[in-house]
């Protein structure tokens, strides 16, 4: 913490300008009025403060706004944003996409994923839902940031907005997030024809249930292995060899290359070996012919 000292009269600050770069930490602390700083935040980013000096300025703002900064200050944080912790950001109420854009630009190239995730969360809360303008801003200024949102926040996305989401925006989404987004995408693209529908729904298929994957296998979609590998394990395991063959089409030979990776490996273990042999790929590890499969989980559920 910065020591409290009185400000020498000749060092008194009446406006935020470049002369402040020559102030020592304790002089900044003693001489800069927090209210003046807040009022002239738009000048701060143009001044080449050291990181140590920025620490002092942050400390000033924290004292002035213990409940969180107002958006008028947040919008002009500039490089001071790099000093913020997720805990600081959690106190904010942000509604302006201009503020979001400004801070996303500042954070680029810095290791600030936790801070950015928290900022986006605050924007969604502040705006009430994840609307099209917010999604457009995220896809333009922070590809992949959509996946930093919790499933709960993503549930506020209206299906009409899903069309603005690009495949690369979903690259870092986990299964729980795709579970939320997939039904919305299904609804958003429901009026499209088979091939067009598949192109659009493909990035969301990590959230698809078995019955939807089975339905796709009847539509000659020729799913690539990259998409197949992203399907939920639970959605893949019940598929028959014939269904997988129809689903993958000419890409079926890729199963051989991926046979040691989940979910392919787990799926192979659930198939009869003679069914696997019909693919002619040399896949091994299926249930030997003549073996009886007992599903003990059914018996446990009944007892």
């Amino acid at each position: 913490d910065v020591e409290r000292t009185t400000c020498p009269p000749e060092k008194e600050v009446h406006e935020i300008d470049e002369s402040l770069i020559f102030y020592k930490k304790r002089e900044l602390e003693a001489c800069v009025d927090a209210a003046l700083l807040a009022a002239q935040m738009d000048r701060v980013d143009a001044i080449p403060f050291t990181y140590e000096q920025l620490d002092v300025l942050k400390h000033k703002l924290d004292e002035l706004y213990p409940q969180g900064y107002p958006e008028s200050v947040i919008r002009h944080l500039g490089h001071l944003f790099l000093k913020m912790s997720p805990e600081d950001i959690r106190k904010w109420n942000v509604t302006s996409l201009e503020t979001l854009k400004a801070l996303l630009k500042v954070s680029k190239g810095h290791e600030m994923s936790a801070q950015v995730a928290t900022l986006i969360d605050r924007v969604v809360v502040g705006r009430g839902q994840l609307d099209k303008d917010t999604v457009d801003t995220l896809t333009a200024f922070c590809p992949g940031c959509l996946c930093s949102l919790s499933p709960e926040r993503l549930s506020s996305v209206p299906p009409s907005v899903i069309g603005a989401v690009r495949p690369q925006d979903l690259d870092t989404c986990g299964p729980r997030q795709l579970d939320v987004l997939y039904p919305k995408a299904r609804l958003a693209f429901q009026n499209m024809s088979g091939s067009e529908y598949f192109v659009k729904i493909r990035p969301f298929l990590g959230g698809a249930p078995t019955e939807d994957v089975k339905a796709l296998s009847q539509q000659n979609v020729s799913m690539d292995l990259a998409t197949f590998m992203k399907l939920r394990r639970e959605a893949v395991l019940p598929l028959t060899v014939a269904e997988v063959q129809k689903l993958l089409g000419p890409h079926v030979e890729g199963l051989k290359v991926e046979e040691q990776h989940s979910p392919v490996r787990d799926w192979i273990l659930k198939q009869r070996q003679d069914d696997l042999d019909t693919l002619g790929l040399g896949l091994q590890g299926g249930i030997p012919n003549g073996y009886l499969i007992l599903d003990l989980s059914v018996r446990e559920a009944l007892s």
Partner: antibody
Framework: EVQLVQSGAEVKKPGASVKVSCKAS????????MDWVRQAPGQGLEWMGD????????IYNQKFQGRVTMTEDKSTSTVYMELSSLRSEDTAVYYC????????????WGQGTTVTVSS | EIVLTQSPATLSLSPGERATLSCSAS???????LSWYQQKPGSSPRLLIY???NLASGIPARFSGSGSGTDYTLTISSLEPEDFAVYYC?????????FGGGTKVEIK
């Protein structure tokens, strides 16, 4: 432009570990597995294993099992290969190479990272 | 594991000549799962041919591949100065993936 950029050369003592990074750009990171291949001085190519960035699933060549660990960070499109219990025979150039999921050929390679193991 | 043996180890030829490189597998390889790479000193390998006979993007038509089962061939119809390098075959028909020992094509 598709690029794989690897971390710089390393000099390690026997028994130590080394962690090499490979940052991908210019393509959908989760549509390709990342494999690691090494080449000892004046020798041929040796496949070490791969990682599926989408699931984090790994497959290792039995020869390196227990010594190699491959990890990924989707947020930065980076994969890592850590090799432990280093010995002089591990002196080699280590390459990351991308492989479209469902195929087995490597269409883009990193520039290589030289790892020297010497006491 | 499948062992790939390349022959000859070194091939000494002049520009304009035809080069034929062989790759023999210790057990059968599915032809879709064989590729060839070129490597020049101090550089990373470069994909030439995949699935036995498909030319990779940007590779000149003088390169071609053929074969099935255990025997595969890479042919360079007329050697250009930039073709002098080491060539590796590679299989992903079974784990672990393996490479051949390489054939060095040098200027005679």
């Amino acid at each position: 432009e598709v690029q794989l950029v690897q971390s710089g050369a390393e000099v390690k003592k026997p028994g130590a570990s080394v962690k090499v990074s490979c940052k991908a750009s210019g393509y959908t990171f989760t549509d390709y597995n990342m494999d690691w291949v090494r080449q000892a001085p004046g020798q041929g190519l040796e496949w070490m294993g791969d990682i599926n960035p989408s699931t984090g699933g790994t497959i290792y060549n039995q020869k390196f099992q227990g010594r190699v660990t491959m990890t990924e960070d989707k947020s930065t499109s980076t994969v890592y290969m850590e090799l432990s219990s280093l010995r002089s025979e591990d002196t080699a150039v280590y390459y990351c190479a991308r492989r479209r999921i469902g195929t087995g050929y490597f269409d883009v390679w990193g520039q290589g990272t030289t790892v020297t193991v010497s006491s | 594991e499948i062992v790939l043996t390349q022959s000859p180890a070194t091939l000494s030829l002049s520009p304009g000549e035809r080069a034929t490189l062989s790759c023999s597998a210790s057990s059968s390889v599915i032809s879709s799962y064989l590729s060839w790479y070129q490597q020049k000193p101090g550089s990373s390998p470069r994909l030439l041919i995949y699935r036995t006979s498909n030319l990779a993007s940007g590779i000149p038509a003088r390169f071609s591949g053929s074969g099935s089962g255990t025997d595969y061939t890479l042919t360079i119809s007329s050697l250009e100065p930039e073709d002098f390098a080491v060539y590796y075959c590679h299989q992903w028909s079974s784990f672990p993936y393996t490479f051949g020992g390489g054939t060095k094509v040098e200027i005679k």
